[in-house]
Amino acid sequence: RKIPKVGHTFFQKPESCPPVPGGSMKLDIGIINENQRVSMSRNIESRSTSPWNYTVTWDPNRYPSEVVQAQCRNLGCINAQGKEDISMNSVPIQQETLVVRRKHQGCSVSFQLEKVLVTVGCTCVTPVIHHVQ
Amino acid sequence: GITIPRNPGCPNSEDKNFPRTVMVNLNIHNRNTNTNPKRSSDYYNRSTSPWNLHRNEDPERYPSVIWEAKCRHLGCINADGNVDYHMNSVPIQQEILVLRREPPHCPNSFRLEKILVSVGCTCVTPIVHHVA
């Protein structure tokens, strides 16, 4: 499936739109809001009852090349005594983001948009109990 | 930009970095993954730091719909089902890349935009600041 074209419900295509070959789109990868910073609470990944670690994945043919992934440290959750409670579950919270993939076919290069699922952190949930009949 | 390896047999005119503007295939790889977090899991309700999901819609952006999490409580849900303020619910935020129509309203011309979204919530031990 493709990116939806602009529907007449919202607006008409302006005359100022750049010409684009069929089946492709023009993408400026100079990022808007490049310098905004995440203002997340201090070190929540270690203060959480479902703590997590971060690993950086690197791919020179991807833009951005660096993507940070979280992994839950425990299967259970950390209780008030600092011990793992396996009656609760640490589970990953995921979010999709877009990346640009650079593909080499011989000496020619093409670009492809790709959805990547990023694990952002973990949360502590009550488990779903499946009883055997 | 990002330096990428090049086939040694190719002409040297090729830039090692990602160019500022690229032509991209309209088809998105992995496009059909589930974008509605309410359908993909019920963690938002089962979490000890539950959250509500708010729909953010913008036709000038792809994806046009993004779900924003807002922690339901300031405290966390304890074993008795009460909200316990000895612990705090906090949002987990993530910067994601989206496409912004540029110039506005153009169907096939975009610019990458970084936006900050709250994806869910987690329960943390609070940092206590006492007055001296």
Partner: antibody
Framework: EVQLVESGGGLVQPGGSLRLSCAAS????????VHWVRQATGKGLEWVSV???????TYNSALKSRFTISRENAKNSLYLQMNSLRAGDTAVYYC???????????????WGQGTTVTVSS | DIVMTQSPLSLPVTPGEPASISCRSS???????????FHWYLQKPGQSPQLLIY???NRFSGVPDRFSGSGSGTDFTLKISRVEAEDVGVYYC?????????FGQGTKLEIK
């Protein structure tokens, strides 16, 4: 129009029980938290308890063992069951609506007129 | 429990003059999420309390713009730029960052 009307107050002997009601109109209890706050004559405000929009609760731990908050969505009503009452529980009891769960302000935006509870022998 | 200390406890003011009430909390009211759940209420004589300011500095709907709130962490202030006769009553500060939620002891504003 948002309205909160408390009832059920009265004179009760020490050790007795009382159930206060708060009838809400103009909004739905499954979209708002509602608090109980009390005020002894000539004194300040003391927070008692809250039931949040999702049905979870938070109590003033000093009162939790004796007081229980509940609600009945079908009647759009809130209750405060008070047991083992003492003279120190004598006060006007207000129910107050918390701001809408989509606003996340955690402030009490509308208050009822209050119902008076007197604990005396 | 968080102790909220207001000053002054009594505030006689001439109509048209400014007024200021301070409130200090025994612990920071900044939640782990970065927000501060500090509010001001007014209880007019014979009435129920009413919300004036929420989350430090936001005026509740219908509250005149002569009321303003400021502060951070543990120290907060309510200012009335020009006091009017209808502003008399007891002003309470309150916090909902930590449970139990607590109120200040109240500041009684009266007209001179």
């Amino acid at each position: 129009e948002v309205q909160l009307v408390e009832s059920g107050g009265g004179l009760v002997q020490p050790g007795g029980s009382l159930r206060l009601s708060c009838a809400a109109s103009g909004f739905s209890l499954d979209s708002y938290g509602v608090h109980w706050v009390r005020q002894a004559t000539g004194k300040g405000l003391e927070w008692v308890s809250v039931i949040w929009s999702d049905g979870t609760t938070t109590y003033n731990s000093a009162l939790k063992s004796r007081f229980t908050i509940s609600r009945e969505n079908a009647k759009n009503s809130l209750y405060l069951q008070m047991n083992s009452l003492r003279a120190g529980d004598t006060a006007v009891y207000y129910c107050a609506r918390d701001t809408h769960y989509r606003l996340y302000y955690y402030a009490m935006d509308y208050w009822g007129q209050g119902t008076t509870v007197t604990v005396s022998s | 429990d968080i102790v909220m200390t207001q000053s002054p406890l009594s505030l006689p003011v001439t109509p048209g003059e400014p007024a200021s009430i301070s409130c200090r909390s025994s612990q920071s009211l900044v939640h782990s999420n970065g927000d501060t759940y500090f509010h001001w209420y007014l209880q007019k004589p014979g009435q129920s309390p009413q919300l004036l300011i929420y989350k430090v500095s936001n005026r509740f709907s219908g509250v005149p713009d002569r009321f303003s709130g400021s502060g951070s962490g543990t120290d907060f202030t309510l200012k009335i730029s020009r006091v009017e006769a209808e502003d008399v009553g007891v002003y309470y500060c309150s916090q909902t960052t930590h449970a139990p939620f607590t109120f200040g002891q109240g500041t009684k504003l009266e007209i001179k």
